[in-house]
C-alpha cells in the first residue's frame, strides 16, 4: 500500500521541517492517491491485454468520465481559479460512482482501491474547504449514480475489464492536469 | 527504459519557421506532459512550452505569438514549430518529459543556429 | 513570471568540499522547485524534485531544503563527476522558470 500522505517515501529524511501548507497537503493527498491508481493499474495490465487494446475508443465513448477542458479555467491560458477549483470538485464528485464501481474489480489490490476510495473522498473535503462558491458545485443524483453502476456491473467480461482500465487511466490524467492547476492557486 | 528521440533542421535564416519533433520510446505517452526547453551558447534554460495528449498546451508568454506545440498520438510523438526566426532564437533544444515534479527525462539536444 | 535567482554564478572548489547553492523565488513557491545539474554538451539532469526529495539513482551526497522563497543545493564532499553546472527550477505556476545557473569548478 502506498505511504500515507504526510511520510512521502521518496523523501529524504528533513530535519525541522515546517508543517504543511493547505496546498502542500492538498498535493500530498493527490500524490497518495496517484500512487494507488499506480498499483491498482499494474493488477489491471498483468492481469488483461486491455492497457494495449486498440479498441479502447470504442469503449470510452460509452463511459462519461470527467475531463478538463479549455473552458474549464484549469489551463494556463484562461486560468481562473474559481471555476477550475469548481470544475476539479465536481469532477471528483463524479468520479466517485466510478470509484465504487471499482470496489470489487481487483482481487490482490482489493485494500488498495478502498484507498483510493477514501482519499479520494478525503481530498474533496479538503477542496471543499478550500472552495469560496460551493453553490456553484453540481452533486450527482444519487439515483442516476445507481443505474449506472448497475449498468456497469451488467456488462460482459470484457468490456468490464476495459471500464476498468479507462476509470483508472482517466483518473490519473484528471488528477495530474487538477495538481497542476491547485499549484497556481 | 523511456527515452526521447529528437530531430530537426539545425540551420535557418532568419524570418524562417523553425520545426523539429521529439518521438518517444519505451514508455507511456498519455500520462505525462511533453515540454520544449531551449538553452542559447554558454546561457541558461529557458522553458518554451509543454503539450498533453489530449492536445492541450501551456506556452511561454514571451514566445506565444510564435510558437506552436502539436501532438501525434499514433506515433507518440510531438512537434515545436516556431516562426520568424532571430539570431536569438540560437539555442539548443530540448524535448523532456515533465513528470509531477520536474523534467525527468531529456531529449539529446538538437543545435539550431539561425544566420544569414 | 516568477524570477529565479542563484547565488553564487560559479564557484571553485577541492575534492571533498562542501559546496552550497542557493537559489530564491521572487515569491513563494511552497516546496514547488527541482534542482539540475548539466555537463558540457550533455542534457540536464534531475537531481531532487519537491525541494528535497532525492530523484532515484542520485548519489546521497546530494541533498536539498527549503520552501517557500529560499532554497539550498547541498552537496555534502564534491566528487570529481560532480564538477558541473546546477540549476533550479520552479514548477509552481507557469511559464516554468530556471535559475541561472551556477557553475562548480575546479580549484
Known amino acids: 500500500a502506498p505511504v500515507p500522505p504526510g511520510e512521502d517515501s521518496k523523501d529524504v529524511a528533513a530535519p525541522h521541517r515546517q508543517p504543511l501548507t493547505s496546498s502542500e497537503r492538498i498535493d500530498k493527498q493527490i500524490r497518495y492517491i496517484l500512487d494507488g491508481i499506480s498499483a491498482l493499474r499494474k493488477e489491471t495490465c498483468n492481469k488483461s491485454n486491455m492497457c494495449e487494446s486498440s479498441k479502447e475508443a470504442l469503449a470510452e465513448n460509452n463511459l462519461n468520465l470527467p475531463k478538463m477542458a479549455e473552458k474549464d479555467g484549469c489551463f494556463q491560458s484562461g486560468f481562473n481559479e474559481e471555476t477550475c477549483l469548481v470544475k476539479i470538485i465536481t469532477g471528483l464528485l463524479e468520479f466517485e460512482v466510478y470509484l465504487e464501481y471499482l470496489q470489487n474489480r481487483f482481487e490482490s489490490s482489493e485494500e488498495q482501491a478502498r484507498a483510493v476510495q477514501m482519499s479520494t473522498k478525503v481530498l474533496i473535503q479538503f477542496l471543499q474547504k478550500k472552495a469560496k462558491n460551493l453553490d456553484a458545485i453540481t452533486t450527482p443524483d444519487p439515483t442516476t449514480n445507481a443505474s449506472l453502476l448497475t449498468k456497469l456491473q451488467a456488462q460482459n467480461q470484457w468490456l468490464q475489464d476495459m471500464t476498468t482500465h479507462l476509470i483508472l487511466r482517466s483518473f490519473k490524467e484528471f488528477l495530474q492536469s487538477s495538481l497542476r492547476a491547485l499549484r497556481q492557486m | 527504459q523511456v527515452q526521447l528521440q529528437q530531430w530537426g533542421a539545425g540551420l535557418l535564416k532568419p524570418s524562417e519557421t523553425l520545426s523539429l519533433t521529439c518521438a518517444v520510446y519505451g514508455g507511456s505517452f498519455r500520462e505525462y506532459y511533453w515540454s520544449w526547453i531551449r538553452q542559447p551558447p554558454g546561457k541558461g534554460l529557458e522553458w518554451i512550452g509543454e503539450?498533453?495528449?489530449?492536445?492541450?498546451?501551456n506556452y511561454n508568454p514571451s514566445l506565444k505569438s510564435r510558437v506552436t506545440i502539436s501532438v501525434d498520438t499514433s506515433k507518440n510523438q510531438f512537434s515545436l514549430k516556431l516562426s520568424s526566426v532571430t539570431a536569438a532564437d540560437t539555442a539548443v533544444y530540448y524535448c523532456?518529459?515533465?513528470?509531477?515534479?520536474?523534467?525527468?527525462?531529456w531529449g539529446q539536444g538538437t543545435m539550431v543556429t539561425v544566420s544569414s | 513570471d516568477i524570477q529565479m535567482t542563484q547565488s553564487p554564478s560559479s564557484l571553485s572548489a577541492s575534492v571533498g568540499d562542501r559546496v552550497t547553492i542557493t537559489c530564491r523565488a521572487s515569491q513563494g513557491i511552497s516546496s514547488w522547485l527541482a534542482w539540475y545539474q548539466q555537463k558540457p554538451e550533455k542534457a540536464p539532469k534531475s537531481l531532487i524534485y519537491?525541494?528535497?526529495s532525492l530523484q532515484s539513482g542520485v548519489p546521497s551526497r546530494f541533498s536539498g531544503s527549503g520552501s517557500g522563497t529560499d532554497f539550498t543545493l547541498t552537496i555534502s564532499s564534491l566528487q570529481p563527476e560532480d564538477f558541473a553546472t546546477y540549476y533550479c527550477?520552479?514548477?509552481?505556476?507557469?511559464?516554468?522558470?530556471f535559475g541561472q545557473g551556477t557553475k562548480v569548478e575546479i580549484k
Open positions: 503539450i498533453f495528449h489530449s492536445g492541450s498546451t
Open positions: 527550477q520552479q514548477y509552481k505556476s507557469y511559464p516554468r522558470t
Open positions: 519537491a525541494a528535497s
Open positions: 523532456a518529459r515533465e513528470e509531477l515534479d520536474d523534467f525527468d527525462i
